[in-house]
């Protein structure tokens, strides 16, 4: 007895595909060993056709796949475009040779069944419309026309020219003639359902002189497309239901026993289990749409169906498309925090993983919005201007080669709570969802900047200090100048670092930054933060206003620059010249519902001056104290 199990007999018809699941005992060795599918020859030799080692025979090229699901202790062999030559005896098995553990599978591929010469075969999908053509001779031009459905020996009338319609075809069947045609009539049956399948006879006239035509109607259930995705990756269901339902509400549902539970529809319904990780995007005016789900979980595996109906709910006799989603737990996408917590006034540093092979890809961070079908407008990107309302408090730090980038958001408010997505313009599977939860602060922030009303005077020296608690003693402290393309580290001086690490005086832990001499372009947002290597921690932000000291006039304390700047720090166009090579972020229009152009203003010279290159001769104005 073989411990491998599978279907002993598989039968299909030419042109179709099969998906054969083989089950193996759940052991570590079995999970990782070679899986194979071979064809049994008359000589007893079993010739490998496909294996999990990557081997694919010539006769299976472009039409077969073998996928291992170690978490289920199964592997699946998919074979498409079957021909009668595929009929034969096969083995699915495990091991380095084809003589190890295996299971015998018999595959039989038949010809598409043929009908008598006078039978016209109509093949339609569920929910579609069929037009049955009925020819007759001139002698029956004025006779009664009808279409009936064979049930055993009887033929039950579906519709006739006296305006009779069988109740089960009410509002679905019409009998008509086109133009001036005198030898043909048509019957349309719409919203096809599986029970409509069968043999129909159309007739013109009565008795022996009647003209009859046979029609075989085949109503096809949607063949589910198989989708194999990794845990924590994303999946896109591309749904094309045809122009006839272009104006009807669209939905995606998940099959559950005999119902199909709606996950999302265009009428605003959304399953709470998919909150923050789903987008429905209309593609065009012909009814095409797509549904993207990120952060795939094990429980997302199953049968999905998209459809259209005015109610936004599944309805029998309306077109559908089907998928079976498999979620592989052996994922290349690392496990990252799905919930990040912050407090008002504080900050969060969110680590976004991306495919390490695509370190040069553009990185983005967007805010998932629940309205309508869900959308995710970009807030920041490697070549995207920071969205209005986030100036001075949002930055993206790329760490090339590390397989991750960090997004920092500070000056948090409870309105920042919600779902955010990390994504790149590269591998679309690497889209991660983070839920940010912002609670009201109950204590003072860890980092505090003095002076809080920061106004520097051109030509003078200006120092700003950041106080940090002893718990950050061993971490690297930094100041950076925020601009639309990031926060560029400045040289700074750590007062606390001179002390013995044994005694830490809470009051004297300070990192300060000096601008000497102050220039007009020094105006803007500055961040004080802590980090350990590439791991960013807490940050706080301050807006430094710059003014000219007019001779003899007293120093006027302006309104709180930080309160003002949060509303509109735009009056000084600090980085105004546009770098042509970075002018536009080429975002995948399929992802973003609002396909706005995101432009990036960045002055290269300014960037050099404000970078952390203390030793360069680039007119560095931020210097050590």
């Amino acid at each position: 007895q073989s411990p491998i199990f599978g279907p002993q007999d598989v039968s299909s018809i030419e042109g179709n595909s099969v998906s054969i699941t083989c089950y193996y005992p759940d052991t570590s060795v079995n999970r990782h060993t070679r899986k194979y599918w071979c064809r049994q020859g008359a000589n007893g030799y079993c010739a490998t056709l496909i294996s999990s080692n990557g081997y694919l025979s010539k006769e299976y090229s472009g039409r077969a796949s073998l996928i291992n699901f170690p978490e289920n202790s199964t592997f699946v062999i998919n074979i498409a475009h079957l021909t009668q030559e595929d009929t034969g005896s096969y083995k699915c098995g495990l091991g380095t040779t084809n003589r190890g553990l295996f299971f015998d599978v018999s595959l039989e591929v038949s010809q598409v069944p043929e009908f008598p010469n006078d039978t016209h075969v109509y093949t339609k999908d569920i929910g579609r419309t069929v037009t049955i053509e009925c020819r007759f001779k001139e002698g029956n031009a004025h006779s009664k026309k009808s279409l009936c459905k064979k049930r055993g020996e009887a033929c039950e009338v579906v519709i006739d020219s006296t305006e009779y319609v069988d109740p089960s075809y009410k509002d679905r069947a019409i009998l008509f003639m086109k133009g001036t045609s005198r030898d043909i009539f048509y019957v349309n049956i719409s919203h096809l359902i599986p029970s409509d399948a069968g043999l129909y006879v159309c007739q013109a006239g009565e008795g022996p002189s009647a003209d009859k035509n046979n029609a075989d109607l085949q109503v096809l259930e949607p063949e589910p497309e198989l989708l194999y995705k990794d845990l924590r990756s994303s999946v896109t269901f591309e749904c094309d239901l045809g122009r006839e339902v272009a104006n009807d509400a669209k939905y995606l549902c998940r099959k559950n026993k005999e119902t199909c539970d709606v996950i999302i529809n265009t009428l605003g319904k959304r399953d709470p289990a998919f909150e923050g990780r789903i987008l429905l995007t209309p593609r065009d005016d012909n009814g095409r749409f797509s549904v993207l789900i990120t952060g795939l979980r094990k429980e997302d595996a199953g049968h999905y169906q998209c459809g259209a109906h005015s109610s936004g709910l599944p309805q029998e006799g309306w077109p559908v498309q089907a998928w079976q989603l498999f979620v592989n737990e052996e994922s290349t996408i690392p496990n990252s925090r799905s919930v990040v917590k912050g407090v008002t006034g504080g900050s969060v540093a969110i680590v976004c993983p991306y495919n390490p092979k695509e370190s040069s890809s553009l990185k983005y961070w967007c805010h998932w919005e629940a309205d309508e079908n869900g959308r995710c407008p970009v807030l920041v990107g490697t070549q995207a201007l920071v969205q209005e309302g986030y100036e001075g408090r949002l930055a993206l730090f790329d760490q090339p080669g590390s397989g991750a980038y960090t997004v920092i958001l500070n000056q948090l408010t409870t309105q920042d709570s919600g779902f955010y997505w990390c994504l790149t313009d590269g591998d679309s599977r690497w889209r991660t969802t983070i839920e940010l939860q912002v609670a009201e602060a109950t204590k003072k922030p860890d980092l505090e900047v003095t002076p809080q009303n920061a106004t520097a005077v051109i030509g003078e020296t200006f120092t700003i200090s950041c106080h940090y608690p002893c718990k950050f003693y061993s971490q690297e402290k930094y100041w950076c100048k925020w601009s639309n393309d990031g926060c560029h580290i400045l040289p700074s001086h750590d007062e606390g670092a001179r002390q013995s690490s044994v005694s830490c005086d809470q009051s004297s832990q300070i990192v300060s930054m000096t601008l000497n001499p102050v220039k007009k372009e020094d105006e803007g947002w500055y961040w004080c933060g802590v980090k350990e290597g590439q791991v960013y921690g807490e940050t706080t932000a301050i807006y430094v206003a710059v003014e000219e000291r007019t001779r003899g006039s007293p120093h006027i304390n302006p309104t709180d620059a930080n309160a003002r700047a949060k509303d509109a720090p735009e009056e000084e166009a600090m980085e105004s010249s546009v770098r042509e090579d970075e002018n536009k972020a080429n975002l995948d229009p399929r992802l973003f519902a609002d396909e706005r152009e995101i432009q990036n203003a960045g002055d290269q010279a300014q960037e050099n001056r404000a970078s952390g290159n203390a030793g360069s001769a680039g007119g560095q104005s931020g210097s050590s104290k």
């Epitope: 007999d9 598989v10 179709n16 289920n72």
Partner: nanobody, 126 residues
């Protein structure tokens, strides 16, 4: 809901044949697989055979103990599954249950099936 009604059980001699039928009614369009399990007195319910389908493709699964003797088939138009049992043995004596599933991960596992019939007794005497 899907209702399943088994028929065809009875008392036969060892070596004889028997054909069981399972008629499905209700929302049968949602079913994806139909199978047979059996339960002998004092024993657990065990997998016998299952047929699953996707469009014109059929997959037939059998327990090792019945391979080569039992054959499962279905009539789509009649929403009926059949179990042809040949070369019956006294060990085959049990109540045979028909089961239907809407989604099937492992056909051998009873809990994967959503609907069950009342069962039909098969007794094989030696």
């Amino acid at each position: 809901e899907v209702q399943l009604v088994e028929s065809g059980g009875g008392l036969v001699q060892a070596g004889d044949s028997l054909r069981l039928s399972c008629a499905a009614s209700g929302r049968t369009r949602t079913t994806y697989g139909m199978g047979w399990f059996r339960q002998a007195p004092g024993k657990e319910r065990e997998f016998v055979t299952t047929i699953t389908w996707s469009g014109p493709t059929n997959y037939k699964y059998y327990a090792d103990s019945v391979k080569g003797r039992f054959t499962i088939s279905r009539d789509n138009a009649k929403n009926t599954a059949y179990l042809q049992m040949n070369s019956l043995k006294p060990d085959d004596t049990a109540v045979y249950y028909c089961a239907a599933s809407t989604v099937l991960t492992d056909p051998r596992v009873p809990t994967e099936y959503d609907y069950w019939g009342q069962g039909t007794q098969v007794t094989v005497s030696s």
